[in-house]
């Protein structure tokens, strides 16, 4: 079940053992180890994005944190699909994509996330407080759904940070920052806690409740513990929803999927693919209350949820066992 | 010891609103995905709302999207269901319960609070 | 979303006899199935996991078994404690419940 790291409190080296650095390498496996250890849940992030080229051109990338295998992704604006929102695109990971106007071209970017590019004018046209959804249908964990929509004064060429706008706090830091650091960290710590054999390791103590033997996992976001209510959807200008797209029924029936090409389907299969997954140029992912990143210019190191370095197809949970984690 | 305390059931008139709380203590409550459950008077247990445990990702049965809506405060431990347009099919006994990933199932639920739709 | 039919709805059986209670799933869920017990005004109780997996604290003569769409929950030498309903859980997908297994004393 759940494994969590007891974390002894910090305390300077004894001198003689550790050299000068004695006391960056006593810290440093502490906060890595409560990183690797730290259990989250299935997860979708949303991030929306207006070009700085075209002002009425929108990027929306969404993307799934689980183990479980997709079978369909919907996007929709205006609120979750069937609960007012429209589908602008539904995206299917064997019959291919199916895209409405003013969707320009929706495709996937890696094995669990797409990406969508909207345009218009007028009446079809997003506006800046419109809110966009991705749900994401996985086995097993169940269908699974997010909303973003882009900061109110948003300069074009930024971002709104991934996931929902109200919930950034440590999802932003988790999901953005930490997921990159951890693969590399996760390694080092056992580097570290290799050549530190003589020094006893932290144990970890599985919770009390559990009805299943602890498992830790190294790939996982941090989720902190946050103060943060979520809003499923937001109320948008209904000036900005288009007014003449029809709504889309994917389950009407396996028949409108026979008229797409075989390659629509296609997929990135490889490392390889997943490597040259296109990343917004002047994005800045803006943290509000652990301030990681700065503000203006400057990227948090972009290795999830756009790049994904697990070479397994399935993701980053095919490491762990039949079960997943929580 | 692993407690969920549910509180603001009542009755309500058709198309009111009513929001439900669950308080949690004795675990992390940051890191589980919490749902709430409901037993209708016939005894069918039905998923109401599903949300993860950073509240960034939700799920509704078809039945409920739109109407309701939940949401947790993760520094007060509580698990919220705002339940709006209420129909007399959503009287229920309306249960908190702890989303456990490693063995896909609810391991640990509240003792319930009752829900009454009715003129 | 897929269908869980429980039989028999009720069923009544002494003390010290042996109980099976089926599960049947709509499509195949796999082994990802759960048990859970509720007892006369009480909340449900998780009872057993993975189909076949006794939860913590669940007494050994409870004994799930099935995988695909058809699954059992066996009690063997029922005790005075174990009437109460039983409710069978799939999770291949959002989770959806039986309509339930009422057992009573007979």
């Known amino acids: 079940m759940r494994t969590e790291a007891q974390v002894p409190a910090l305390q300077p080296p004894e001198p003689g053992l550790e050299g000068a650095m004695g006391h960056r390498t006593l810290v440093l496996p502490w906060v890595l180890l409560t990183l690797c250890v730290t259990a989250g849940t299935p997860e979708v992030w949303v991030q929306v994005r207006m070009e700085a080229t075209e002002l009425s051109s929108f990027t929306i990338r969404c993307g799934f944190l689980g183990s479980g295998s997709i079978s369909l992704v919907t996007v929709s604006w205006g609120g979750p699909n069937g609960a007012g929102g429209t589908t602008l695109a539904v995206l299917h990971p064997e019959r291919g994509i199916r895209q409405w106007a003013p969707a320009r071209q929706a495709r996937w970017e890696t094995q669990s996330s797409i990406s969508l590019i909207l345009e218009g004018s007028g009446a079809s046209s997003p506006c800046a407080n419109t809110t966009f959804c991705c749900k994401f249908a996985s086995f097993p964990e169940g269908s699974w759904e997010a909303c973003g929509s882009l900061p109110p004064s948003s300069d074009p060429g930024l971002s709104a940070p991934p996931t929902p706008a109200p919930i950034l706090r440590a999802d932003l830091a988790g999901i953005l920052g930490v997921s990159g650091v951890l693969l590399f960290g996760c390694v080092y710590l056992l580097h570290l806690l290799r050549r530190h054999k003589h020094r006893p390791a932290p144990r970890l103590q599985p919770s009390r409740t559990s009805p299943q033997a602890p498992r830790a996992r190294a790939w996982a976001p941090s989720q902190a513990s946050q103060a943060a209510l979520h809003v499923p959807y937001a109320t948008i200008n209904t000036s900005c929803r288009p007014a003449t797209l029809d709504t889309a029924h994917p389950h009407g029936g396996p028949s409108w999927w026979a008229s797409l090409p075989t390659h629509a389907a296609h997929r990135p299969q490889g490392p390889a693919a997943w490597a040259s997954t296109p990343i917004p140029a002047r994005g800045s992912f803006v943290s509000v209350e652990n301030g990681l990143y700065a503000q203006a210019g400057e990227r948090p190191p972009h290795t999830g949820p756009g790049l994904t370095l697990f070479p397994d197809p399935r993701g980053p949970r095919a490491m762990e066992g039949p079960l997943g984690v929580r | 010891e692993v407690k969920l305390v549910e509180s603001g059931g009542g009755l309500v008139q058709p198309g009111g609103s009513l929001k439900l709380s669950c308080a949690a203590s004795g675990f992390t409550f940051s890191s589980y995905t919490m749902s709430w459950v409901r037993q209708t008077p016939e005894k069918r247990l039905e998923l109401v709302a599903e949300?993860?445990?950073?509240?960034?990702?939700?799920h509704y049965p078809d039945n409920v999207k739109g109407r309701f809506t939940i949401s947790r405060d993760n520094a007060k431990n509580t698990l919220y269901l705002q339940m709006s347009s209420l129909k007399s099919e959503d009287t229920a006994m309306y249960y908190c319960?702890?989303?456990?990933?490693?063995?896909?199932?609810?391991?640990?639920w509240g003792q319930g609070t009752s829900v009454t739709v009715s003129s | 979303d897929i269908q869980m039919s429980q039989s028999p709805a009720s069923l009544s059986a002494s003390v010290g006899e042996t109980v099976t209670i089926t599960c049947r799933a709509s499509?195949?869920?796999?082994?990802?199935l759960a048990w859970y017990q509720q007892k006369q005004g009480r909340s449900p109780q998780f009872l057993v996991y993975n189909a076949q997996t006794l939860a913590e604290g669940v007494p050994s003569r409870f004994s799930g078994g099935g995988s695909g769409t058809q699954f059992s929950l066996k009690i063997n030498s029922l005790q005075p404690e174990d009437f109460g309903s039983y409710y069978c859980q799939h999770h291949y997908g959002n989770p959806t419940f039986g309509g339930g297994t009422k057992l009573e004393i007979k």
């Open positions: 319960a702890r989303h456990n990933w490693d063995v896909y199932a609810m391991d640990y």
């Open positions: 949300l993860s445990n950073s509240g960034g990702s939700f």
């Open positions: 499509e195949n869920v796999n082994s990802y």
